[in-house]
């Protein structure tokens, strides 16, 4: 978990502090908030990024209808507990001893309870649907060009293996990107779809997590793709457990 950049910075995570006291005097970068060393050759986990953020001085229609079990992150920012590998702990609690269970992307998947609440396992989010609305353009984007550009973005900028970008749907002005990654599919070293989606979300909001890079400049055949709204749905391998009160609200 060290970075060996000449100028001792972390290209994939600006929420770090780097110093030349790693093994052999090499550059080592640590996430703010947790103090954990991070691997600057890949994306940092969403849990460590959220922790750093909280510590630093939100007809056959081609569009997908999110499942009834899809979760949206309505709770906003919180200071999460991360496990030794930087993943979200299954149970999260706030300072007032209110606790809840989260999935692998840190989104609440149960009602809130007290300290007696049990979260037996971290449930994996295996399907993420990123729903974007782009600003008006002279005409619609060519679907295959748009598809190719978004796949390239996830492959090159976020280092996500192309096989995890399941589909790109387009019905002007709505774009949907489907990311799928089962536990069995994710090999050691593979970027997690939850981390890639979080980096993308921050890029779209103009809050890039990359060090020193310009913001995201998305273009399709030279035409700027400017996003005006983003909604992300998370589907877990095991459906969430909310009370009927919430479901009917």
């Amino acid at each position: 978990h060290t970075a060996a950049q000449d100028n001792c910075t972390c290209p994939t995570n600006k929420m770090t502090v780097c110093s030349p006291d790693g093994p052999g005097g090499r550059c080592q970068c640590r996430a703010l908030g947790s103090g954990m060393a991070v691997d600057c050759s890949t994306l940092t986990s969403k849990c460590l990024l959220l922790k750093a953020r909280m510590s630093a001085p939100k007809n056959a229609r081609t569009l997908v209808r999110p499942s009834e079990h899809a979760l949206v992150d309505n709770d906003g920012l919180y200071d999460p507990d991360c496990d030794p590998e930087g993943r979200f702990k299954a149970r999260q609690c706030n300072q007032t001893s209110v606790c809840w269970c989260v999935n692998s992307v840190g989104v609440r998947r149960t009602d809130k309870g007290d300290l007696s609440l049990r979260c037996d396992e971290l449930v994996r989010t295996h399907h993420i649907l990123i729903d974007l609305r782009h600003r008006p353009t002279a005409g619609a984007f060519n679907h295959s060009d748009l598809d190719a550009e978004l796949r390239r973005l996830f492959r090159e900028r976020y280092r996500l293996h192309p096989k995890f970008v399941a589909a790109v749907h387009y019905e002007q002005p709505t774009i949907q990107i489907e990311l799928r990654q089962n536990t069995s599919q994710k090999a050691a070293g593979d970027v997690d779809i939850g981390d890639a989606a979080y980096y993308f979300e921050r890029d779209i909001k103009g809050e890039s997590l990359f060090q020193g890079r310009g913001g995201l400049d998305l273009r399709v055949r030279g035409e700027p793709l400017q996003v005006e709204r983003t909604l992300i749905y998370y589907l877990d391998e095991i459906p969430p457990k909310f009370s009927m009160k919430r479901l009917t609200a």
Partner: antibody, heavy 116, light 111 residues
Framework: QVQLVQSGAEVKKPGASVKVSCKAS????????IGWVRQAPGQGLEWIGD????????NYNEKFKGRATLTADTSASTAYMELSSLRSEDTAVYYC?????????WGQGTLVTVSS | DIVLTQSPDSLAVSLGERATINCRAS??????????MHWYQQKPGQPPKLLIK???NLESGVPDRFSGSGSGTDFTLTISSLQAEDVAVYYC?????????FGGGTKLEIK
């Protein structure tokens, strides 16, 4: 050569505050974390927290949060550790060290005695 | 917090003999690349002195009779041939996550 020189011994009353300084020389002060560790008489080492002078970033051991304050004056290449609401159990030698963990250079230590 | 348990608490070894000190972490402090465990020597009235960094990297100026090994949760500091000047208390420390805790120390004496 790298050196960390700490301020002299202090005697304080319970409830008071103490501020220990650590002057660094021989390296670029803003490039390395400065950690603070204490050692009660006859006891082991206890990590208080650390500060990155280059950006003022700090980490604290939860046990000391709210009582310990780490600061740094980059113009003077000096780090400070202030501990408030002192009690007798805070009697210890306080050390500064260069590095996040695996501190390679240490100050000589500052004895802080808390006694009424 | 990660708890580091050192064993034994104290150790008496004859001059020229091998001394072995263990440190067990309550959770893994290693990645596939590095182990975030360090070893210090402290003599009475002196600050700790770094001996081994990242489990096995000998600090410059430290005699090569000192060596470190281990990964995951179990780490060892070995002195291959004990010298009189090695009498001291030895501490392990991790730097995996905040807080960077220390082990309780092992007092090494001459038998």
């Amino acid at each position: 050569q790298v050196q960390l020189v700490q301020s002299g011994a202090e005697v304080k009353k319970p409830g008071a505050s103490v501020k220990v300084s650590c002057k660094a020389s021989g390296y670029t002060f803003t490039n390395y974390w400065i950690g603070w560790v204490r050692q009660a008489p006859g006891q082991g080492l206890e990590w208080i927290g650390d500060i990155y002078p280059g950006g003022g970033y700090t980490n604290y051991n939860e046990k000391f949060k709210g009582r310990a304050t780490l600061t740094a004056d980059t113009s003077a290449s000096t780090a400070y550790m202030e501990l408030s609401s002192l009690r007798s159990e805070d009697t210890a030698v306080y050390y500064c060290a260069r590095g996040t963990g695996g501190g390679d250079y240490w100050g000589q230590g500052t004895l802080v005695t808390v006694s009424s | 917090d990660i708890v580091l348990t050192q064993s034994p608490d104290s150790l008496a070894v004859s001059l020229g003999e091998r001394a072995t000190i263990n440190c067990r972490a309550s959770q893994s402090v290693s990645t596939s690349s590095y182990s975030y465990m360090h070893w210090y020597q402290q003599k009475p009235g002196q600050p700790p002195k770094l001996l081994i960094k990242y489990a096995s990297n000998l600090e410059s100026g430290v005699p090569d009779r000192f060596s470190g090994s281990g990964s995951g949760t179990d780490f060892t500091l070995t002195i291959s041939s004990l010298q009189a000047e090695d009498v001291a208390v030895y501490y392990c420390q991790h730097s995996w996550e905040i807080p960077y805790t220390f082990g309780g120390g092992t007092k090494l004496e001459i038998k």
